[in-house]
């Protein structure tokens, strides 16, 4: 069964730096990855980055760098410039468009009492949507 996993990590050395890691588990090839925050893409979420395996990546502030980790996983580095640390309570969502499976999405966030370097579990009920 296709599945999307999401991790949110806080840098141990720089508490203003966060990284969102996400990946697609399942057959098929990835045609597009969209990372958003504040909710799922197209459902109240704001795009942070779009990654295409051949056309490259595009990102929007506060995203700093979007990169492929493997052919089915990506990482997105974020710079939290605000003193109030808005990332701490934010939901990050990753949507993978895959052929022939369709689109699958899951969300995760950093726990409120997160230690530096800690990864967040996915939200209790990931949004797994096959379009």
């Amino acid at each position: 069964t296709p599945e999307v996993w999401v991790q949110v990590q806080m840098e141990a050395t720089e508490l203003s730096s966060f990284t969102v890691h996400c990946g697609f588990l399942g057959p098929g090839s990835i045609s597009l990855v969209t990372v958003s925050w504040g909710g799922p893409d197209g459902a109240g979420g704001t795009k942070l980055a779009v990654l295409h395996p051949e056309l490259g990546t595009r990102q929007w502030a506060p995203a700093r760098q979007a990169r492929w980790e493997t052919q089915s996983s990506i990482s997105l580095a974020l710079e939290d410039s605000g003193a109030s640390s808005p990332f701490a309570n934010t939901t990050f969502c990753c949507k993978f468009a895959s052929f022939p499976e369709g689109s699958w999405e899951s969300c995760g966030s950093l726990p409120p009492s997160s230690d530096p370097g800690l990864s967040a579990p996915p939200t209790p009920v990931p949004i797994l949507r096959a379009d």
Partner: antibody, heavy 118, light 107 residues
Amino acid sequence: QVQLKQSGPGLVQPSQNLSITCTVSGFSLTGYGINWVRQSPGKGLEWLGVIWSGGNTEYNAAFRSRLSISKDTSKSQVFLKMNSLQADDTAIYSCARDSTGLYAMDYWGPGTSVTVSS
Amino acid sequence: DLQMTQTTSSLSASLGDRVTISCRTSQDISNFLNWYQQKPDGPLKLLIYYTSRLHSGVPSRFSGSGSGTDYSLTISNLEQEDIATYFCQQGYMLPPTFGGGTKLEIK
């Protein structure tokens, strides 16, 4: 088929540096991460670091100050360099492929046995 | 670093038995748990990733389960070729860490 081959010295003098090359075949480094792990009787399995397909690296904080991982994608090679080795760095050093981003290492090199001794 | 504990360092079982190997983590790792097999003088072999996903080519008698801080690897019908040492490993937070291993032997 997927293969990871390793080359490097078996014996290293204390305070000297270690260089190991992992040459892969059967897949491209443009789609996979390569981890480095070492294993010794005293310390068990220790993850050293990874270089992802995009070139970004992550290191175990315990080794970050003396560890460097790089690659030459065109030659299908990944390089581990570790400085200032001591006796307790004696171990088997292995490279291992990551296809999911989950640090799940699905194919491993044979390992390079490194002894630090004068 | 996150601690991985395999409380049973060695385990004896008979061929055909159902064998369960346990792994406990020092904090919730949200299913980011992998299992490996290692035979003497050989490299590690990935069996299970993300708690329960079977790696390609691994026999279906191997299965993984668990959540939170408690995870297990089950071999449903032990065969001679399964005699090896089994390691759990978390990929939840840096650095990824391994358990100390459980050596499986024939009774």
